[in-house]
Interface confidence: low
């Protein structure tokens, strides 16, 4: 059975957290970062579909970077393999409406993190 | 306390348009997504899709694609609904409802009071 | 799209009675994440539809605990352990999986 600390939501085998307030994307994975975490890193379609469902109206900063003209990676430094298109030019990628799109780095937005589930 | 009040009743011809109108309050408006969902006299409910108030971004059952168009003001948190090229058969009560955002996106948890939306030559 | 079909259509009990409305869709409604978006709506006449169940059996705040609903993959059940006289309108089942949401013909509960 997944454990998840209190405010975290578990799905597969991970926990998520679900950011009420706004930061840019680097404060962003700051946050994660103090809590034992990174941006979320969406490893499946189904994972994919569960983000979208569960985040509501606002779009979610995710785990996803690229330096100009450079592939996608996540926070782990993994390259992305392309399971699902990112819209936009910017060089980080959040969850909107409809799927994965891109900004520029300096924009606010909620965030989503992500690290593995607790088995007790 | 939370409520949407709808736009009042309206009779058309067939051919034009009508704009539907819902106002939120109690809550905040860009924080839930908003549903159409109508009903012909004496008969069941049909769900025509979903804005969100946040992004302005759309869903529309396929059925209602082309002839509908879902819009926001946030500044007046007010949703709209526009039905184009209306026929007899849409004459029916347009409702608006809201969805909790979180794992119960999907479901209405407050419905407005209805629009008749009566179509007739 | 899903067909949601609701049995009976009309359905007629005594005050105190037990009442049992079927809903059956024609795929399964567990959603990727798991969760199962089946929900109950009852409509008064001239009122708006209020949600009683959503998730298949999770009650609404304010839904009076006679009302339950269950079920899984396609078959759905609301039950009334006792109707009262507030209770006579028509019931929807609702599917929230698959896309576009689609809603049950809808049951007509009257008192005998």
């Known amino acids: 059975q997944a454990a998840c600390p209190e405010s975290w939501i578990g799905f597969q085998r991970k926990c998520f957290y679900f950011s009420d307030d706004t930061k840019n994307w680097t404060s962003s994975q700051r946050f994660c970062d103090s809590q034992d975490a990174d941006l979320a890193q969406v490893e499946s379609f189904q994972e994919l579909n569960f983000l979208l469902r569960y985040k509501g109206p606002s779009d979610h900063w995710i785990g996803l970077s690229r330096e100009q003209g450079q592939p996608w990676k996540w926070i782990n430094g993994t390259e992305w393999t392309r399971q699902f298109p990112i819209l936009g030019a910017g060089e980080c990628a959040y969850l909107n409406d409809k799927g994965a799109s891109s900004a520029r780095h300096y924009t606010e937005r909620k965030w989503i993190c992500s690290k593995s589930d607790i088995h007790v | 306390q939370v409520q949407l009040v709808q736009s009042g009743a309206e009779v058309k011809k067939p051919g034009a348009s009508v704009k539907v109108s819902c106002k939120a309050s109690g809550y905040t408006f860009t924080g839930y997504y908003m549903h159409w969902v109508r009903q012909a006299p004496g008969q069941g409910l049909e769900w025509m899709g979903w804005?969100?108030?946040?992004?302005?971004?759309?869903n529309y059952a396929q059925k209602f694609q082309g002839r509908v168009t879902m819009t926001r003001d946030t500044s007046i948190s007010t949703a709209y609904m526009e039905l184009s090229r209306l026929r007899s058969d849409d004459t029916a009560v347009y409702y608006c409802a809201f969805a909790q955002p979180g794992a119960e996106t999907l479901n209405f948890d407050l419905w407005g009071r209805g629009t008749l939306v009566t179509v007739s030559s | 799209d899903v067909v949601m079909t609701q049995s009976p259509l009309s359905l007629p009990v005594s005050l105190g009675q037990p009442a049992s409305i079927s809903c059956r869709s024609n795929?399964?409604?567990?959603?990727?994440?798991?969760?199962?978006?089946l929900n109950w709506f009852q409509q008064r006449a001239g009122q708006s539809p209020r949600r009683l169940v959503y998730k298949v059996s999770n009650r609404d705040s304010g839904v009076p605990d006679r009302f339950s609903g269950s079920g899984s993959g396609t078959d759905f059940t609301l039950r009334i352990s006792r109707v009262e006289a507030e209770d006579v309108g028509v019931y929807y089942c609702m599917q929230g999986t698959h896309w576009p949401y689609t809603f049950g013909q809808g049951t007509k509960l009257e008192i005998k």
């Open positions: 804005i969100n108030p946040n992004s302005g971004g759309t």
């Open positions: 795929q399964s409604l567990v959603y990727s994440d798991g969760g199962t978006y």
